[in-house]
Amino acid sequence: MMTGTIETTGNISAEKGGSIILQCHLSSTTAQVTQVNWEQQDQLLAICNADLGWHISPSFKDRVAPGPGLGLTLQSLTVNDTGEYFCIYHTYPDGTYTGRIFLEVLESSVAEHGARFQIP
């Protein structure tokens, strides 16, 4: 019986050009995590395998950094990065748990630009 639950950061927003940490946490189970897949819709970003380490999809290798932990850091964000991200936890003996994160990448705010160039 699968007793675990995935906790995620839920809906998050970040600024264009910045970075964000995608983080999931599996709780309420003693199952062993054997692999975590990070996916955006049907596109693989990375796999973290307990035995082997990380496989970063070549399409993302310049913008994705492993960690912290089983999480994933997405860098140099663009508006096209807006969307759903999934952490898929493969566990033994429970099976597969999936968590969802929605990321919205925002244009730099006018207020922030205004603050930077404020006349004293």
Epitope: T34, Q35, N37, L44, I47, N49, A50, D51, L52, G53, W54, H55, I56, S57, P58, S59, P66, H90, T91, Y92
Partner: antibody, heavy 127, light 107 residues
């Protein structure tokens, strides 16, 4: 020398579930540096990768089939299995299992070629 | 996904002739390109891994070259037993993909 052998029903009815097993002999399925694949080939057509499983249960499936595919592993029997549900005539094919090797180092890993293949088993979807 | 485009689809060749089969990837795959030979009613047999490394037992007339997106399998001095379909395969990126195949027929 490692050998792979596919087994399962040769005929499956539309809308039912196709179930195949690949038995590994001459080596352990639990080796850290291998991943275990299913590939299919419709009559007169090319090869289509279905997905893989690692001995500890980690999988990745072809997005084109993901909603219908489950690959599982039984290390005690040195076997891994494929289930494909809601089959149609388009799933008629020769199904192969194959061993892929993995390169790892420095905290990263990479997928290598598939160096050992089963002989294949023909599955026909028909009522 | 990475699309592998093979050409030609079909080639009819006389014995002892040289055969060149090309495989083009839709994006760079480095050197993660492999070749397989499949004869009728048989499973694919590994020929060459990582562009140019021959598997043991593969005749020296088979060779591979290329990098990035463009790759070539060459059969020098074709023999009758080489009649088969040849597939390229990339392991750089998931999902793993295969080329559409090139059928080589002996004239």
């Amino acid at each position: 020398q490692v050998q792979l052998q596919e087994s399962g029903p040769g005929l499956v009815k539309p809308s039912e579930t196709l179930s195949l097993t690949c038995t590994v002999s001459g080596g352990s399925i639990s080796s850290v540096y291998f991943y275990w694949n299913w590939i299919r080939q419709p009559p007169g057509k090319g090869l289509e990768w279905i997905g893989y499983i690692y001995y500890s249960g980690g999988t990745y499936y072809n997005p084109s089939l993901r909603s219908r595919v489950t690959i599982s592993v039984d290390t005690s029997k040195n076997q891994f299995s494929l289930k494909l549900n809601s089959v149609t005539a388009a799933d008629t094919a020769v199904y192969y299992c194959a061993r892929g090797s993995i390169a790892a180092g420095g905290g990263y890993f990479y997928y290598n070629d598939m160096d050992v293949w089963g002989q294949g088993t023909t599955v026909t979807v028909s009522s | 996904e990475i699309v592998l485009t093979q050409s030609p689809d079909f080639q009819s060749v006389t014995p002892k002739e040289k055969v060149a089969i090309t495989c083009r990837a839709s994006q760079s795959i480095g050197s993660s390109l492999h070749w397989y030979q499949q004869k009728p009613d048989q499973s694919p047999k590994p020929l060459i891994k990582y562009v140019s490394q021959s598997f043991s037992g593969v005749p020296s007339r088979f060779s591979g070259s290329g990098s990035g997106t463009d790759f070539t399998l060459t059969i020098n001095s074709l023999e009758a037993e080489d009649a088969a379909t040849y597939y390229c395969h990339q392991s750089s990126s998931l999902p793993l993909t295969f080329g559409g195949g090139t059928k080589v027929e002996i004239k």
